[in-house]
């Protein structure tokens, strides 16, 4: 359920507020609906960077749970093949705040277009 993914993103944002994480993350800020699955997989990969950089058990557990929820939601959509989409490394690098903002935006795209 994508709303549960949103809930975990809110938890992550709450948890990182007191931390100083300098990482920049590959971020898709203008998702084309026909590339949303590809973009989501990039977000999930980059989310693991936050987990590693934080060194925080609560963030690690929340990220792990979020990835499971998101992958379950993606698989319930069936095996979607997308072509002509950007590779993760082609995306713009942004700070954690902007990354999470764009992450919420793409999850909302899945909710709104379901």
């Amino acid at each position: 359920n994508w709303v549960n993914v949103i809930s975990d993103l809110k938890k992550i944002e709450d948890l990182i507020q007191s931390m100083h994480i300098d990482a920049t993350l590959y971020t898709e800020s203008d998702v084309h609906p026909s590339c949303k699955v590809t973009a989501m997989k990039c977000f999930l990969l980059e989310l693991q960077v936050i987990s590693l950089e934080s060194g925080d058990a609560s963030i690690h557990d929340t990220v792990e749970n979020l990835i499971i929820l998101a992958n379950n939601s993606l698989s319930s959509n069936g095996n979607v093949t997308e072509s002509g989409c950007k590779e993760c490394e082609e995306l713009e690098e942004k700070n954690i705040k902007e990354f999470l903002q764009s992450f919420v935006h793409i999850v909302q795209m899945f909710i709104n277009t379901s």
Partner: antibody, heavy 119, light 108 residues
Framework: QVQLQESGPGLVKPSGTLSLTCAVS?????????WSWVRQPPGKGLEWIGE???????NYNPSLKSRVTISVDKSKNQFSLKLISVTAADTAVYYC????????????WGQGTLVTVSS | SSELTQDPAASVALGQTVRITCQGD??????ASWYQQKPGQAPILVIY???NRPSGIPDRFSGSSSGNTASLTITGAQAEDEADYYC???????????FGGGTKLTVL
């Protein structure tokens, strides 16, 4: 600076159709944002009507869904609201607004236009 | 019934601090945003996300969230802060946007 401007008739007859347009300037309607209509009956609170994304995706307030259509015209950089079978209860100030990226918010609003439903 | 509940009215003495609250189960999933509306004017976004202020909004406005409650705090209220304040978020399905009923703030 993004600006939004509502336009349309200020008076609509009962059982008629309310039609409004929101012209967007200072930014593109083809941005990553969703675009919404919100209304406010005289002396009452705000009510969300529905939203549209420039690819044509829409979501509507369940209480209005059967009567509402929101559409987008990318060539004119505008989006429109159509509300059918109106009654006096639909009398309100109608606002168009741009949704922010990420967590729920409306970062830009039109100035609003009063639509009265009366014969 | 609204998914977001606000007290209809609040008051604060000039220069004092006031907290306006918004309650709803959906706030466990989503942050709320807050709007100030003065008579005859369109609403203005004052707080969004965890605690973000758009440019031009004074730093006396701040937001916070705990459980199913979001709060807007005005520290050192000014006469010009007298207005209606609305919270906004998504409903439990995530599909629909919702507003609280609004809180009329009087500055004494």
């Amino acid at each position: 600076q993004v600006q939004l401007q509502e336009s349309g008739p200020g008076l609509v007859k009962p059982s008629g159709t309310l039609s409004l347009t929101c012209a967007v300037s200072g930014g593109s309607i083809s941005s990553s944002n969703w675009w919404s209509w919100v209304r406010q009956p005289p002396g009452k609170g705000l009510e969300w009507i529905g939203e549209i994304y420039h690819y044509g995706y829409t979501n509507y307030n369940p209480s209005l869904k059967s009567r509402v259509t929101i559409s987008v015209d990318k060539s004119k950089n505008q989006f429109s609201l159509k509300l059918i079978s109106v009654t006096a209860a639909d009398t309100a100030v109608y606002y168009c607004a741009r949704e922010g990226i990420g967590w729920p918010s409306f970062d830009y609003w039109g100035q609003g236009t009063l639509v009265t439903v009366s014969s | 019934s609204s998914e977001l509940t606000q007290d209809p009215a609040a008051s604060v003495a000039l220069g004092q601090t006031v907290r306006i609250t918004c309650q709803g189960d959906t706030l466990r999933n989503y942050y709320a945003s807050w709007y100030q509306q003065k008579p005859g004017q369109a609403p203005i976004l004052v707080i969004y996300g965890k605690n973000n202020r758009p440019s031009g909004i004074p730093d006396r406005f701040s937001g916070s969230s705990s459980g199913n409650t979001a709060s807007l705090t005005i520290t050192g209220a000014q006469a010009e802060d007298e207005a209606d304040y609305y919270c906004n978020s998504r409903d439990f399905s995530g599909k629909n946007l919702v507003f609280g009923g609004g809180t009329k703030l009087t500055v004494l």
